[in-house]
């Protein structure tokens, strides 16, 4: 039940990458506005995005307080210009979101190859340690800070003249791989959390190739 002329939100969906977390829903409002509330399973409800005509609400500030908690959100619908109005049951119409556990469910953002350096037949490839919006002691934590050894990177590397992709893995942000002397190689990395069952992998980083600006070559 609810106020006449208001409809309940539906298709509540969490969109989250590297802990930047937005709740989206439908429909686009016609003569109504929305307020969102978020809570942990054991906590109190906190209101966000008051009386908005948007169909999304950035909840990052709330979920980064404890990314291992499980959160629930709900979206309230109110008649535009009459937000005190309630439904016949004495409260506004609302719809619950699915539960969301950021640590287990946030998508891994596209990684970036920071640099690569060749020394003889070895190449050191470094992945940028992306900053998240998770804070500790007033400092923003990196993806590695948050996930620790749960996060690995897979490096795909191949000779510029060939199509077969070799792989290497690391639970740091650095790879040291063997290459053939005199050959140019290309690189792409993927972030992976092997312990997950869903949202396990990021999209691939942009491809970087030797002979381009990111790299450095030293003959030893």
């Amino acid at each position: 039940s609810g106020t006449t002329n208001t409809v309940a939100a539906y298709n509540l969906t969490w969109k989250s990458t590297n802990f930047k977390t937005i709740l989206e829903w439908e429909p686009k409002p016609v003569n109504q506005v929305y307020t969102v509330q978020i809570s942990t399973k054991s906590g109190d409800w906190k209101s966000k995005c008051f009386y908005t005509t948007d169909t999304e609400c950035d909840l990052t500030d709330e979920i980064v307080k404890d990314v291992k908690q499980t959160y629930l959100a709900r979206v309230f619908s109110y008649p535009a210009g009459n937000v005190e109005s309630t439904g016949s049951a004495g409260e506004p119409l609302y719809e619950n979101s699915p539960e969301f556990t950021p640590y287990l469910e946030t998508n891994l953002g596209q990684p970036t190859i920071q640099s690569f350096e060749q020394v003889g037949t070895k190449v050191n490839v470094t992945v940028e340690d992306e900053r998240t919006l998770v804070r500790r002691n007033n400092t923003f934590l990196s993806l590695r800070d948050v996930f620790g050894k749960d996060l690995i990177y897979t490096l795909y590397y191949w000779k510029s003249s060939s199509s077969g992709k070799k792989t290497a893995k690391t639970n740091t942000n650095e790879f040291l791989i063997d290459v053939d002397k005199g050959e140019n190689y290309c690189f792409s990395v993927q972030a992976v959390i092997p312990s997950r069952t869903v949202n396990r992998k990021s999209t691939d980083s942009p491809v970087e190739c030797m002979g381009q600006e990111k790299g450095e070559f030293r003959e030893i």
Epitope: I152, Y156, K165, A168, T170, Q190, P194, T197, D204
Partner: antibody, heavy 120, light 107 residues
């Protein structure tokens, strides 16, 4: 329940072609890497190649390079092994296996295998 | 490619025996070695990962160890269901490579 089911094996003449399928259930193949491994009668395990279905990247053993092609259809949650220019020495049971891309273990689930016999 | 040299190729043992199988990598593979058990007509099953960790559901009589590039699979007290072929595998670099296999037969 995680399951891999291979199909498409059979008898084929030297120089012929065959396409094997590896149908996955209980997980999404694009979240993993899929390998093909073969075993000739009475012999050991030989790695054939892999595909990462999320980006299409592949790599092959030298023994099959240029003749075999691994592909995946994520909408069908299935990986394929296209085998061309088959030789008698390609006779084997072919397995697909799931790789969770962990530092710690490679192939945690295997299919039951499908037999490919190359003979005239 | 990294070679995995496995020995012995076969052994005969009795129920209750302690059995040891070794694998030597041709170069450093860190701890990226797994052991599999295979029975006739069946797919291989993962026993040990990361050189020494027991995979879920595997009996504790199986264990693995590493010393440099040498890797060992030990069955502390052989059971009737353990008669099978065992393979080591490195997954440190592409291509992943297997040992030749060790067939454990009944004496």
């Amino acid at each position: 329940e995680v399951q891999l089911v291979e199909s498409g094996g059979g008898l084929v003449q030297p120089g012929g072609s065959l396409r094997l399928s590896c149908a996955a259930s209980g997980f999404t193949i694009s979240d993993y890497v899929i390998h093909w491994v073969r075993q000739a009668p009475g012999k050991g395990l030989e790695w054939v190649g892999y595909i990462d279905p999320s980006n299409g990247y592949t790599y092959y053993a030298d023994s099959v390079k240029g003749r075999f092609t691994i592909s995946a259809d994520t909408s069908k949650n299935t990986a394929y092994l296209q085998m061309n220019s088959l030789r008698a020495e390609d006779t084997a049971v072919y397995y697909c296996a799931r790789d969770p891309q962990s530092l710690f273990y490679p192939f945690d689930y295997w299919g039951q295998g499908t037999l490919v016999t190359v003979s005239s | 490619d990294i070679q995995m040299t496995q020995s012995p190729s076969s052994l005969s043992a009795s129920v209750g025996d302690r059995v040891t199988i070794t694998c030597r990598a041709s170069q450093d593979v860190n701890t990226a070695v797994a052991w599999y058990q295979q029975k006739p007509g069946k797919a291989p099953k993962l026993l040990i990962y990361s050189a020494s960790f027991l995979y879920s559901g595997v009996p504790s009589r199986f264990s693995g160890s590493r010393s440099g590039t040498d890797f060992t699979l030990t069955i502390s007290s052989l059971q009737p269901e353990d008669f099978a072929t065992y393979y080591c595998q490195q997954h440190y670099t592409t291509p992943p490579t297997f040992g030749q296999g060790t067939k454990v037969e009944i004496k």
